[in-house]
Interface confidence: medium
């Protein structure tokens, strides 16, 4: 995201009342059917080229429709701000016939204290401002409307939340004479789910709350706390899920100890102990009673909150997430790496993969990547055989069914796939690795080998030569 | 394109009522707040209120309350305000607009003018 | 109930020259604003939206500036066609106030 290059002040508008009937307008379709790829897996792209057709068949009756843009709505109640007072908001493209919304939170790091909040405002003012919105945005990934590129969810109610209150959607202060900036993520996004129910939400039946990095974080904080908000305000019918990517980090040692003094340096327990203070952040309830008061920054740590949450939450996180390595002081700078730091990087992988034994709805390949669900590619990295829409597939069809008292795993539909070979980028879906002075695509071998990695201890547990284990991964097998 | 198509002038009697209409098209009608401001000859512009066409929500200026009902009939697209108990203070242009999101009214419809006199 | 001054009420000026209004809130409105022109006999128009931000179609000779409690609508290069009189609107909480209007004369 981009961040890594990087109350309520007086009575306003109250909430859409609930709606005594949820039946759409005159003249709309109750429900378009989901597509379930499951019968034309072995012959997807000759489905996907009847879809296409159909679609481009359609255009003329509803060119409206197959726009992709999202467009901007701020918010009407002002009072709800990014961190400088301006409002914050939304962007929405409705699918008229679904009754699946999908709310993506935005990510981009965060800032604790006056000093960094001054250097984001001066460098990142997107991040903690509307003032420069644009009025549309493309959906991609997750968030297209195209069944190519999203053979998951194409056809929901997409709304993406742009990110500019810097407290991982945790915040709820208000702006005033002592607070420099707001910190609301967590009333932006209630007041964006109040202001949603009168636009069709209210007719929902499944709410995805998604996220990515500081956004994944935000999912793990406040997916209960929106089901408990649609339940008190009358729609205890819709099924509110959690999609976090990118956002379930570890509390771990770093790899060299640097001071608390900026965002990227700063250990995230420090970090987020400082956070919680300045941005008045608030955690779901039943992980703050696990822990004393001024603990309550375990609560920003997946594999500590995600054992307290009612709603089923689908966890994307990349074996070697290129956020958590910048925090614990890992900066792969181009230089062949040190055993110690391969070490390191090894060991980081085998915690998080045991953090996530325990999830039964995860997706974890082994790449050094950060963020998977809105890039137009994220169809393409597979763990086990298995891609993300179709894991995300499966996991649909998993709740689904098990309304039904159906516990086992669907034969042929896995949705714990976790990778266990042990270092970056063994799993040769993963995306392209770049030089990052020339920019160059490294093929797998050439970044194990500038990894330092000695080929000879790669291949043995494999039972392989180091030389057919070259030429494996050289063809991308 | 979108267009908001207000009712003919109107000339009542002091103590009465008026019902005037705003008929919107060119948008999905239930999607955007419909606002009303009032117009007195030769003077500056004042917000009545809004209406949410998507669920009949509406909110009004405490001056306008008891005077100004706002209501919608999504089925015809059309946004209606009864003004009741007139006196020559009502006589004014009443517009219509379209609250576009985006801190805004973005489309007004042409005005209606009401004239109260005995 | 928040107050919008705007000033000058009125200003004479000739095709060419440039103008700026200014909009005052009584209290921080951040960047809750709107501005409009508007011609005898006819319905206002939304020339700038989120204080700064110009609406589809409108020349580019029109900015507007600001935020907080200061507000300032510019016009370079004045055109017969901008005569008419113009009002800025808040929308931090309701009612949602107009200033008195400035009403922009040819010389």
């Known amino acids: 995201s981009e961040g890594r290059k990087t109350w309520r002040r007086r009575g306003q508008q109250p909430p859409p009342p609930p709606r005594t009937e949820a039946a759409p307008a005159a003249g709309q379709p109750v429900e378009s059917f989901p597509l379930d790829f499951t019968a034309v897996e072995g012959n997807m792209d000759s489905f996907m080229a009847q879809v296409k057709s159909l679609a481009q068949s359609l255009y003329p009756c509803s060119a409206q429709q197959l726009n992709e843009d999202l467009r901007l709505h701020l918010l009407l109640n002002t009072s709800v701000t990014c961190n400088d007072g301006s409002p914050a908001g939304y962007y929405l493209k409705e699918s008229r016939g679904s009754r699946r919304w999908l709310l993506f939170l935005e990510g981009g790091w965060y800032c604790f204290n006056r000093e960094n909040c001054d250097s984001r405002y001066d460098t990142m003012r997107r991040l903690m401002s509307s003032r420069d919105w644009p009025r549309t945005r493309t959906g991609t990934g997750i968030l297209s409307s195209q069944p190519e590129e999203n053979p998951y969810w194409w056809n929901a109610n997409m709304v993406f939340i742009p990110y500019c209150s810097s407290d991982v959607w945790s915040g709820a202060s208000s702006k005033s004479e002592k607070n420099e900036y707001a910190f609301m993520g967590a009333l932006i996004i209630q007041e964006v789910v109040r202001e949603l129910l009168g636009r069709g939400l209210s007719g929902a039946k499944v709410l995805l709350l998604a996220g990515s990095s500081a956004g994944g974080t935000g999912v793990l904080l406040n997916v209960d706390r929106v089901a408990e908000q649609l339940e008190k305000l009358g729609y205890p019918a819709i099924q509110v899920r959690g999609l976090a990517d990118s956002g379930w980090f570890l509390d771990n040692k770093q790899y060299r100890h640097t001071d608390c003094v900026d965002t990227i340096t700063c250990a995230p327990t420090e970090a987020i102990r400082r956070g919680i203070r300045y941005w008045n952040g608030v955690v779901p309830e039943r992980c703050r009673r696990q822990f004393q008061e001024g603990e309550e920054w375990n609560c920003f740590f997946g594999y500590k909150v995600y054992p307290t949450l009612r709603c089923p939450v689908f966890v994307v996180q990349w074996l070697f997430d290129e956020a958590q390595l910048t925090v614990d002081n890992v900066h792969l700078t181009g230089q062949p790496v040190q055993e110690g730091l391969r070490l390191y990087i090894q060991n980081l992988g085998r915690e998080l993969r045991h953090t996530l034994k325990d999830v039964p709805a995860s997706f974890a390949p082994a790449c050094l990547s950060h963020e998977i669900i809105i890039r137009s590619h994220w169809t393409d990295v597979q763990v086990k055989g298995t891609s993300l829409p179709r894991a995300l597939h499966c996991w649909d069809r998993s709740l689904h069914d098990s309304h039904k008292a159906s516990k086992t795993p669907l034969k042929g539909c896995p949705v714990h796939l976790v990778d266990s070979c042990p270092w970056p980028h063994c799993n040769p879906s993963c995306p392209t690795v770049r030089d990052q002075f020339t920019g160059q695509e490294m093929n797998v071998a050439q970044f194990l080998m500038h990894m330092g990695f000695d080929m000879q201890t790669v291949a043995q547990p494999q039972g392989l030569e180091p030389s057919e284990l070259l030429g494996m991964l050289s063809n991308g097998s | 394109q979108i267009q908001l198509q207000q009712s003919g002038p109107e000339l009542v009697k002091p103590g009465a009522s008026v019902k005037i209409s705003c008929k919107a098209s060119?948008?999905?009608?239930?999607?955007?707040?419909i606002n009303w401001v009032k117009q007195k000859p030769g003077q500056g512009l004042e917000w009545i209120g809004w209406i949410y066409p998507g669920n009949g929500n509406t909110k009004y200026n405490e001056k306008f309350k008891g005077t100004a009902t706002l209501t919608v009939d999504t089925s015809s697209s059309t946004a209606y305000m009864q003004l009741s108990s007139l006196t020559s203070e009502d006589t004014a242009v009443y517009f219509c607009?379209?609250?576009?999101?985006?801190?805004?009214?973005?489309?007004w419809g042409q005005g209606t003018s009401v004239t109260v006199s005995s | 109930d928040i107050q919008m001054t705007q000033s000058p009420a009125s200003l004479s000026v000739s095709v060419g020259e440039t103008v700026t209004i200014t909009c005052r809130a009584s209290e921080n409105i951040y960047i809750n604003l709107a501005w409009y022109q508007q011609k005898q006999g006819k319905s206002p128009r939304l020339l700038v939206y989120?204080?700064?931000n110009l609406a589809d179609g409108v020349p580019s000779r029109f900015s507007g500036s600001g935020s907080g409690t200061q507000f300032s609508l510019k016009i370079n290069s004045l055109q017969s066609e901008d005569f008419g009189t113009y009002y800025c609107?808040?929308?931090?909480?309701?009612?949602?106030?107009f200033g008195g209007g400035t009403k922009l004369e040819i010389k």
């Open positions: 607009a379209r609250y576009g999101n985006l801190l805004d009214l973005d489309y």
């Open positions: 989120a204080a700064t």
């Open positions: 609107q808040h929308f931090w909480g309701t009612p949602y106030t």
């Open positions: 060119g948008y999905r009608f239930t999607d955007y707040y």
